[in-house]
Amino acid sequence: SERCDDWGLDTMRQIQVFEDEPARIKCPLFEHFLKFNYSTAHSAGLTLIWYWTRQDRDLEEPINFRLPENRISKEKDVLWFRPTLLNDTGNYTCMLRNTTYCSKVAFPLEVVQKDSCFNSPMKLPVHKLYIEYGIQRITCPNVDGYFPSSVKPTITWYMGCYKIQNFNNVIPEGMNLSFLIALISNNGNYTCVVTYPENGRTFHLTRTLTVKVVGSPKNAVPPVIHSPNDHVVYEKEPGEELLIPCTVYFSFLMDSRNEVWWTIDGKKPDDITIDVTINESISHSRTEDETRTQILSIKKVTSEDLKRSYVCHARSAKGEVAKAAKVKQKVPAPRYTVELACGFGAT
């Protein structure tokens, strides 16, 4: 056969679907690789062909579209499973071609099992809710296109093994789940089960997402530098190790980049000749407020180093702050025989 533009195995599209549930999978060619859509391709006389390679096999084989009850079918650029089976796991290829043109891409499809509490190897999307922020909602994801708008599905929401009913501050409202006032206790995995009829059969769609309650923008403040501060003086003798921690608290801010850096005499440590090392550690609170600590270290400090200006800087979407460390050279302890003796009037 003639050459085909092969986009390879698109591992970015690691598609996971639940066993015994419907799945609709769009050919990734039109979404990520080609500059035209399926309708344009179809009207230009191009044909979309599907085939697959079973898990742990090398042999590419056509997809059987003649299974009972049309279990697997194709509609435009969508491959449908009604429903999936565990052994549908494998690499699927969609190829667009005519006599003069060919383009194809493969993607992995994993059919996963869930237990009665909806635990599974499925990678879960994370939805962040602001703590004590007023009514916030999550929506049952990825259910569009499974049934026409004329069909009214039933939706049941769960937290773990338990149906969400009579909860203090969580109310199921169809496809939405409303949190009247989100609290830390609302952290966890939430599952919606959408049940709908089709051609005399009943299908279930299960979608689980993780809710993480985070700091509210109402409470967000600019970075706070806890150290260095005015109460601690770093007093060293030449030859000793100088260690200065810069500890900064950052309020949680959605999509904010938190930065901490040191300057020495107004320059970044990389831009000066001192042998300085900086180690960073990061910790998070339960609401994802962040504490960053950068420890500036000079193994053998010189008297010149002890005259320099050491400033810790921090920046977030809320603002920028800086604080200088108080560094000084330790006055050598007096030598008894000379200084002290003189003090006592000895000649």
């Epitope: 509490c117 093994c161 338990y162």
Partner: antibody, heavy 122, light 107 residues
Framework: QVQLVQSGAEVKKPGSSVKVSCKAS????????IQWVRQAPGQGLEWMGY????????DYAQKFQGRVTITADESTSTAYMELSSLRSEDTAVYYC???????????????WGQGTLVTVSS | EIVMTQSPATLSVSPGERATLSCRAS??????LAWYQQKPGQAPRLLIY???TRATGIPARFSGSGSGTEFTLTISSLQSEDFAVYYC?????????FGQGTKVEIK
């Protein structure tokens, strides 16, 4: 180590109510559910309902709807099961049980209280 | 509601022998089945969940098998402390339901 300690035995008259308590010690930070199960003398186990103390969610078995109320006081880590309109057939040992989290499939009855005998007699 | 039926009601076994207990569900419960042991005057104790996974601290002589509607609890070599009543429980569908129990007694 999580433990569940239940209130003592009760003798009740038909038509009255009983309230059994179940105090959890060493509770984890994560939400969990407290289940209530009863066992009539020489009989099997019968699930009555549950409550999730930190979230308020609860549900009851159809058989007990309207007669049972399960509540919880988070501040004292104590759950309560109140059964009203008692009859002689309600004579049983009432157990509370729990798992570590809301997500442990099959381990929602991991830890059990010692049981509370409720005798209904005129 | 799913009905769980255990058999036999009573099983007489000599110490050291193998005991096989059965549990049948009125409809498929997948592998969402647990087994409990209850001794006189005590609360039940979780032995097996997920049809075949031993709970923490349960000896290896206890094993579970089955899926769908047919399940088995096997005690490979009965010890004196194993004489008790055993209950199966499904947690596939609400309400979660228990079997009526199998009493394992000394022959």
């Amino acid at each position: 180590q999580v433990q569940l300690v239940q209130s003592g035995a009760e003798v009740k008259k038909p038509g009255s109510s009983v309230k059994v308590s179940c105090k959890a010690s060493g509770s984890p930070a994560e939400p969990y559910a407290i289940q209530w199960v009863r066992q009539a003398p020489g009989q099997g186990l019968e699930w009555m309902g549950y409550i999730i103390p930190s979230l308020g969610g609860y549900d009851y078995a159809q058989k007990f709807q309207g007669r049972v109320t399960i509540t919880a006081d988070e501040s004292t880590s104590t759950a309560y099961m109140e059964l009203s309109s008692l009859r002689s057939e309600d004579t049983a040992v009432y157990y509370c049980a729990r798992g570590q989290t809301l997500y442990d499939s099959g381990r929602q009855f991991d830890i059990w209280g010692q049981g509370t005998l409720v005798t209904v007699s005129s | 509601e799913i009905v769980m039926t255990q058999s036999p009601a009573t099983l007489s076994v000599s110490p050291g022998e193998r005991a096989t207990l059965s549990c049948r569900a009125s409809q498929s419960v997948s592998s969402n089945l647990a087994w409990y042991q209850q001794k006189p005057g005590q609360a039940p104790r979780l032995l097996i969940y997920g049809a075949s996974t031993r709970a923490t601290g349960i000896p290896a002589r206890f094993s579970g098998s089955g899926s769908g509607t047919e399940f088995t609890l096997t005690i490979s070599s009965l010890q004196s402390e194993d004489f008790a009543v055993y209950y199966c429980q499904q947690y596939n569908n609400w309400p979660w339901t228990f079997g009526q129990g199998t009493k394992v007694e000394i022959k």
